[in-house]
């Protein structure tokens, strides 16, 4: 058993069928030592009396918030969580495998630039009883601060039969240093309480690894006189780091019919301007990349031949 | 070239060299976020490796200051990674295919190192770390991890390069 | 008061189908697993199972696995035990019981029902 | 399974005799043993639970002790309605399990 904060407490259980159960103490947090008395949630039935509760934590039907009082006034709670680990594993019931970019995989995050800043979301089929406390370092041992917001409801989509949530949370590296080359990975820890189910997520990542910049913006087209060529420019993404002589981005030219089917003429430029020919029907569309590191593609960011 | 003790280095012909250097580490090992390296276990690989840290000067306003720290710093790491492409767990077994970007990596590294640093100057290098995988699986291992390090090595590089070459060269 | 009410006693023959229940008043139902014990004539106490009112979270005795059914109904605080096909050697004074939450055993027991099964 | 034996299986006493009933648990159980009362045509209560600790409303002459394997249960002094079947039951690892019972009758 251990604490998550103050009063609530975290059992961890092996959940197989013939595990024995887990034996827990409580203690009153009072100096009151005579006519204590506890109960459990709502009820009001007394469960035991003393200064001291030893229960046994087998099913979540044995965790919830544990009472003590004296003479009808409460004296001290203690609420307590189960985390399940089956066949060695912990349990994770409450998260949605996104299974991108592989299996198991619960937390998914992206930065859309060096600056230390990062957003990681999550899905759960679940809608109510849920809280997430977010929390996270660079590096393990000796960890440096990373400061994370609240998680937030970001978005609710319709799978089928069930509802989706997504949760989403922003995190900044508290002393970023946007020039260097990570050696020590960010690591990011999700808690997850789900009515009396307690469960943990953990990613570890290198921000140069999860870097996804924002579409090109400005994206404009010129015709150049007398050809079927037009010249395509763009200019970078507010969002991405600077100075951009130093922070370079490698640009990726679509020509694409209005078919799915049709053939795609493709460009691949450091510069932010190209000259492609424009088909009738056709749409035009560019993204970014980092220059130097192979992370992700931005976005399309698209504009009509016509 | 850069002659330690102040002079510019050839900045265009060293970003060129940067940025064929980020492409060829990206040939030899393309295989991203198909193999989570972290999870096996580091510490005795990549921990020796020398990483262009904060106060190394290779942002663009210590580069604007004084580019020779980051420099040098850029050679050491270029001298280290050569030697261990040419170790033998890059030549042991299992065998690279003949047609390798590895070998290309191996000479471009020797290549910008020069640019760097011409014959008879000498910045102090750190010492490679004795590093003999006894089976070919970690030598395999091994030579992935140091490929993604690599990776994000000159890349950093291949910024301060960029950076020098639009901002710096006379 | 704690009250768990049982249905009347069953006559069935074999392979008659049949679901017993168990009412609960005088606690929050959902606060409280509910359990099912056997008594065959002139015999001891088996220990059939136990169910959470909350979710349907069920632990079967493996000797009970797949020749009983337990059921929940929240909004009528009810608990069921149910047979698809009853045997001769089904013949017992069924209780069920209220599991002590951060203990295990049964704190408050119902009554009984006593099920005949005979041709 | 744990397997519960209990000793003896029956036991003739006089009221006002002190009563001493053994349950051994074929494993360890800890402390998390039940006594339950059996009166013919009435269904058990709860006398006892972890071992040693009085349900609510039960008399005082009841006491329960034992940890691990070997387990008592004990009526100090024996009242007329305390002569009935008396089960003991493990609530560590499922299956819970009951012991065979011990008849408690008069001599």
């Known amino acids: 058993i251990w604490e998550l904060k103050k009063d609530v407490y975290v059992v961890e259980l092996d959940w197989y069928p013939d595990a024995p159960g887990e034996m827990v103490v409580l203690t009153c947090d009072t100096p009151e030592e005579d006519g204590i008395t506890w109960t459990l949630d709502q009820s009001s039935e007394v469960l035991g009396s003393g200064k001291t509760l030893t229960i046994q934590v087998k099913e979540f039907g044995d965790a919830g918030q544990y009472t003590c009082h004296k003479g009808g006034e409460v004296l001290s709670h203690s609420l307590l969580l189960l985390h399940k680990k089956e066949d060695g594993i912990w349990s994770t019931d409450i998260l949605k495998d996104q299974k991108e970019p592989k299996n198991k995989t619960f937390l998914r995050c992206e930065a859309k630039n060096y600056s230390g800043r990062f957003t990681c979301w999550w899905l759960t089929t679940i809608s109510t009883d849920l809280t997430f406390s977010v929390k996270s370092s660079r590096g393990s041992s000796d960890p440096q601060g990373v400061t994370c917001g609240a998680a937030t409801l970001s978005a609710e989509r319709v799978r089928g039969d069930n509802k989706e949530y997504e949760y989403s949370v922003e995190c900044q590296e508290d002393s970023a240093c946007p020039a260097a080359e990570e050696s020590l990975p960010i690591e990011v820890m999700v808690d997850a309480v789900h009515k009396l189910k307690y469960e943990n997520y953990t990613s570890s990542f290198f921000i140069r690894d999860i870097i996804k910049p924002d579409p090109p913006k400005n994206l404009q087209l010129k015709p150049l006189k007398n050809s079927r060529q037009v010249e395509v420019s763009w200019e970078y993404p507010d969002t991405w780091s600077t100075p951009h002589s130093y922070f370079s981005l490698t640009f990726c030219v679509q020509v694409q019919g209005k078919s799915k089917r049709e053939k795609k003429d493709r460009v691949f430029t450091d510069k932010t301007s190209a000259t492609v020919i424009c088909r009738k029907n056709a749409s035009i569309s560019v993204r970014a990349q980092d220059r130097y590191y192979s992370s992700s593609w931005s976005e399309w960011a698209s504009v009509p031949c016509s | 070239r850069a002659v330690p003790g102040g002079s510019s280095p050839a900045w265009t012909q060293c970003q060129q060299l940067s940025q064929k250097l980020c492409t060829l580490a990206w040939s030899a090992h393309p295989l991203v976020g198909h193999m989570d390296l972290r999870e096996e276990g580091d510490e005795e690989t990549t921990n020796d490796v020398p990483h262009i840290q904060c106060g190394d000067g290779c942002d663009p306003q210590g580069l604007r200051d004084n580019s020779q720290f980051c420099l040098q710093r850029i050679h050491q790491g270029l001298i280290f990674y050569e030697k261990l492409l040419g170790s033998d767990i890059f030549t042991g077994e299992p065998s690279l295919l003949p047609d390798s970007p590895v070998g290309q990596l191996h000479a471009s590294l020797l290549g910008l190192s020069q640019l760097l640093q011409p014959e008879g100057h000498h910045w102090e290098t750190q010492q490679i770390p004795s590093l003999s995988p006894s089976q070919p699986w970690q030598r395999l291992l091994l030579r992935f991890k140091i490929l993604r390090s690599l990776q994000a090595f000159v890349a950093v590089a291949a910024r301060v390069f960029a950076h020098g070459a639009a901002t710096l060269s006379p | 008061e704690v009250q768990l009410v049982q249905s009347g006693a069953e006559v069935k023959k074999p392979g008659e189908s049949l679901k017993i229940s168990c009412q609960s008043s005088g606690y929050t139902f959902t606060s409280y697993w509910i359990g099912w014990v056997r008594q065959m004539p002139g015999q001891g106490l088996e220990w059939i199972g136990i169910?959470?009112?909350?979710?349907?979270?069920?632990r079967y005795n493996p000797m009970f696995r797949g020749q009983v059914t337990m059921s929940v109904d929240k909004s009528s605080s009810t608990a069921y035990l149910q047979w698809s096909s009853l045997k001769a050697s089904d013949t017992a004074m069924y209780y069920c019981?209220?599991?002590?939450?951060?203990?295990?055993?049964?704190?408050?027991w119902g009554q009984g029902t006593m099920v005949t099964v005979s041709s | 399974e744990i397997v519960l034996t209990q000793s003896p299986a029956t036991l003739s006493a006089s009221p006002g005799e002190r009563a001493t009933i053994s349950c051994r648990a074929s494993q360890s159980v800890g402390t998390w043993v039940a006594w339950y009362q059996q009166k013919p045509g009435q269904a058990p209560r709860s006398l006892i639970y972890?071992?040693?600790n009085l349900q609510s409303g039960i008399p005082a002459r009841f006491s329960g002790s034992g940890s691990g394997t070997d387990f008592t249960l004990t009526i100090s002094s024996l009242e007329p309605e305390d002569f009935a079947v008396y089960y003991c039951q493990q609530y560590n690892i499922y299956p819970y399990t009951f012991g065979q019972g011990t008849r408690l009758e008069i001599k």
């Open positions: 972890a071992a040693s």
């Open positions: 169910m959470s009112p909350v979710d349907s979270d069920i």
């Open positions: 019981a209220r599991r002590r939450p951060g203990q295990g055993y049964f704190d408050f």
